[in-house]
Structure formats: C-alpha cells, structure tokens
Amino acid sequence: FERTRSLQDPCSNCPAGTFCDNNRNQICSPCPPNSFSSAGGQRTCDICRQCKGVFRTRKECSSTSNAECDCTPGFHCLGAGCSMCEQDCKQGQELTKKGCKDCCFGTFNDQKRGICRPWTNCSLDGKSVLVNGTKERDVVCGPSPADLSPGASSVTPPAPAREPGHSPQ
C-alpha cells in the first residue's frame, strides 16, 4: 500500500516526478521511464521529448523535467524550445528554398543564420563610406564629407575659461 499525509484531495500530495494514478486508488505513482511531471498534483506524466535526427540532446529528460534539444553541427535552433533546426549557411549567404545563396550586391550577412541585410546608407546620416561593404560585412561609415574638407578640423576647440563669480554673457 502507499501512505500519504493529506486530508484534502489526495492528488494534491503527489510531488513532481509522480502522477495521481486514478486506476490505483489515486496513489502517487512514479512517472514511468521516458516520462516526467514537472509539477505536483498531476494526473498524468508527459512523454519525454526525444532529440533525434538533426536534434541532439542538450539536457537529458528526468522524472521531473523534459529533455532539452539543440541542433547538430551545421544547423541552428529556431522556435520556442528549439522546435526546429535550420541549416547553417556561410557568412555572406542566406538560406533560400534552393539552399544557401550568396548575398546580392549591396547586402551582407555576418552570421551563419538569418537573411542578407542591406548595407548601411551612410549618406542618410550625412556621413561617408569609410570602409566598403562586402557580402560578409556592413560598410563602415566615417565622418561627413564636409568634416574632411581642407582646413577643417575634426577636433572641437575647448570652451573659453570662465572666471569665478561671472556668468556667461
């Protein structure tokens, strides 16, 4: 027999890792292998997630917690809890329905996942291109062309010193 110390709903006494077994007078039965219950008072145990194929096990299942998966090398996780694995591409590429394709001119991707994004338009910020963009790297914006004209100084002159007790004019 099984003893629990509860005067209320007997199922409320069933801790994580067990389930309230209605088929057996509501005793707290341990979760069978390959199943778990992460909270107390559960009437069933959930089947452990299996990390198969392109998924690999990051954390093993236990009687109280589900397995956690990540992706095998060459793939990366997508979705909540790594519900999908997506193929990696090289930097300078994006994944399309036809596989990995190089970024078009004017776009870049500095990661193995995600899409190619347009280079930054330096002129929108009134700046000039300091370093050209590539498929793998964004452009580097530098000072505006006006800042680089002859005689112009990029150093801001210091503010004039003020004597104590005088307010600015």
Epitope: F1, E2, R3, T4, R5, N13, C14, P15, A16, G17, T18, D21, R24, N25, I27, C28, S29, P30, C31, P32, P33, S62, S63, T64
Partner: antibody, heavy 122, light 108 residues
Amino acid sequence: EVQLVESGGGLVQPGGSLRLSCAASGFSFSANYYPCWVRQAPGKGLEWIGCIYGGSSDITYDAQWTKGRFTISRDNSKNTVYLQMNSLRAEDTAVYYCARSAWYSGWGGDLWGQGTLVTVSS
Amino acid sequence: IQMTQSPSSLSASVGDRVTITCQASQSISNRLAWYQQKPGKAPKLLIYSASTLASGVPSRFSGSGSGTDFTLTISSLQPEDFATYYCQSTYYGNDGNAFGTGTKVTVL
C-alpha cells in the same frame, strides 16, 4: 564512489525493535532515485519491503506484509534512509539490503548495498 | 501483484541457451526487471523495462515480454552465469514491486 552502505544489523530478541540505516555516497536521493529496502532470509529468495520517494515528500511504498511493523524514513540532510523494525519475529531473520530504484533504469534497482544481517532469536 | 518464475531450478552446460519465464498476476506493461545473484552477494541488475540491457551487462542476456508474461534468455551460458535469477515488477504501489520466486541455474 557511488555506493550504499547499510548498518545497524545484529542480534535482537523476539518482540524487540531495530533501526537499520543506509548511507548513500556519490549521489543524492531525488525524484529520480528512490531508496528501497529488500530482505533475504537464509537460503530463501528476495523479498521487497518498500521504498520511499527520493525527494522531499514523505510518500512511501510498502509491501502489505509489513502491516505497519516496518517503517521507512529518510533524512535528506544526511543522505540516509532508515528502516525501523518493530515487533520482530524469528521469521524476520534475514540479510537486509538497501537498494536504489532509479528512473533511469526503469525503476529497477541499479545500485545495492552489501547487506546487513539481522538475527531475531532468544 | 504476485510474480511467479519458472522453472525454480535448472541444470545446463556452458554454451547452452537458457530461458527463464516470469508471470505477473496482473498486467504490468513493460515494468519488469531481471537480476542475477551469486551466493553471499547483493543482486545485480541485468535488464530493466523488460528488454533494456543494464549498463555493463553482456549482450548474451536478453529480455522480452509485456503485460503479464516475460522471458529472460541467456543465448550462450558462460561459467560466470551460474547463479540465481530473479524477476521484479517495478510497477510501484499496491505491492507492485514484488520479486519473483527465483530460478537457480546450476552446472549439469
């Protein structure tokens, strides 16, 4: 080293009481590892006594034949499980084993102590 | 739950195929373990979940069955396999963890 070590066995008179201890080392009892007691009378088979939930709850699973004479308890701070045996009879003479029932092994006993002999005799 | 093993004893020779059966008094799904015990030693887990080999157990041991009828097979008996074998229900609660009566395997 992962092991279970029983202690507390010995000679006891009929009607007497005894408390056996089982100290775990190298792992902790948890919801994945339940401590259990099994006994074996001389020349006889294995007999399941009971188990206790390995976490912080006091749920016990006992063989009906124990009829409340045997009680399993646990001290998580010491990682030790106990078997309190009362109203002992000659037929309780046996080697008493502590075992670990593991979720990872289908709740089979994947780790056993060396056993401690209890002799009930006047 | 009562667990009945048969035979209670058997004699065999090295290299023989040995089969031991275990019957549960009610369905226990696949929640069955098999143990080997040698004189003066604690039992050793061989198989769990009816058919899964425990770590370090030689592949000549195998288990099968589900529900109420289970079998332990030793495909080619080795000298170190002469021992007593027990089945155990691992179906917790209501006397769910009972052991079988045991099968002693001796040299022919």
